[in-house]
């Protein structure tokens, strides 16, 4: 499966939208930094087949969609930017789902690496727990926004490696 060029552009647009979403100066939030334990090894793309890598990317985007679809999120971020953000995420999910369908029967390995999916879910659970503990404060959301931007940048690297594997 070839991930379309539009997918890469959508990823870039997602990062640009997130960069615009800031509401307060992040300089006031330094003390709220937190180690969410980003599962770097799941995005190295060396240890599993292409279909499994796609499923991990899909899970990360789905979890991001869920995180930013809450009422607490809607109360924090600009509605217009959020709508654009959802559109881009939806586009990426569709691309990855189409890709996963094409990979059915292409590889002998399972389409999903359950352990990797669970690792990504636990990562997002830690993010949600942090937000809850911080009572969804503006600074907590700034820290989460920075974390998600970083994770999207790292996942973009995995997507590029997948494209070079074609």
């Amino acid at each position: 499966c070839d991930l379309p060029q539009t997918h890469s552009l959508s990823n870039r647009r997602t990062l640009m939208i997130m960069a615009q979403m800031g509401r307060i100066s992040p300089f006031s939030c330094l003390k709220d930094r937190h180690d969410f334990g980003f599962p770097q090894e799941e995005f190295d793309g060396n240890q599993f087949q292409k279909a499994q890598a796609i499923s991990v990317l899909h899970e990360m985007i789905q979890q991001t969609f869920n995180l930013f679809s809450t009422k607490d999120s809607s109360a924090t971020w600009d509605e217009t930017l959020l709508d654009k953000f959802y559109t881009e995420l939806y586009q990426q999910l569709n691309d990855l789902e189409a890709c996963m369908m094409q990979e059915v029967g292409v590889e002998d390995t399972p389409l999903m690496n359950v352990d990797s999916i669970l690792t990504v879910r636990k990562y997002f659970q830690r993010i949600t727990l942090y937000l809850t503990e911080k009572k969804y404060s503006p600074c907590a959301w700034e820290v989460v926004r920075a974390e998600i931007m970083r994770s999207f940048s790292l996942s973009a690297n995995l997507q590029e490696r997948l494209r070079r594997k074609e």
């Epitope: 992040p26 300089f27 330094l30 709220d32 930094r33 969410f36 820290v143 974390e147 970083r150 940048s153």
Partner: antibody, heavy 121, light 107 residues
Framework: EVQLVQSGAEVKKPGESLKISCKGS????????IGWVRQMPGKGLEWMGI????????AYSPSFQGQVTISADKSISTAYLQWSSLKASDTAMYYC??????????????WGQGTLVTVSS | DIQMTQSPSSLSASVGDRVTITCRAS??????LNWYQQKPGKAPKLLIY???SLQSGVPSRFSGSGSGTDFTLTISSLQPEDFATYYC?????????FGQGTKVEIK
Amino acid sequence: EVQLVQSGAEVKKPGESLKISCKGSGYSFTSYWIGWVRQMPGKGLEWMGIIDPSDSDTAYSPSFQGQVTISADKSISTAYLQWSSLKASDTAMYYCARHPGLNWAPDFDYWGQGTLVTVSS
Amino acid sequence: DIQMTQSPSSLSASVGDRVTITCRASQSIDGALNWYQQKPGKAPKLLIYFASSLQSGVPSRFSGSGSGTDFTLTISSLQPEDFATYYCQQAYDFPLTFGQGTKVEIK
């Protein structure tokens, strides 16, 4: 390879203006903040201020607020430190260093080589 | 501003010695403390971040500990290349502040 390359040494007279630069390469320039640190001859490190190149938001140490201006041009991955009127006491080595912002990652993990500024009449 | 106080300001040690440098913050900074090494004419180099995390490429003889207000940098077995000045820096809040430095000299 991540690099921060600073502009060359400067010799200036009191009252003159100056702008020194720090060019980042080998990483996404807008994903990291750039901090500036002063080291006067034979002395320790003093944090001056920081900039987020993605939107040019800045924060200064109270000691340097109003004394210097930090700016950035993300189109050329470069941060700047400038003075409108230099004093002899500005004589020092100035370093830039990258900072991960609100991410849980090493602070000031890469540094420029330093720019020596000498102010003398 | 958060004040950072290092001790000692200088020390003399021999190759193979265990060296300990302490840093105290004027208020709690959780674990938001970094340690840097600087050699004459060179830019500082990050050794330890968030109190105890070893920066990539830094020898394992360097270690950091502490939280709250009291922190320690330990060099388990001093090597010739370790003679330098060491700085702590609080990463908890702006303005960021450094300790005054500890110079490690050859005995």
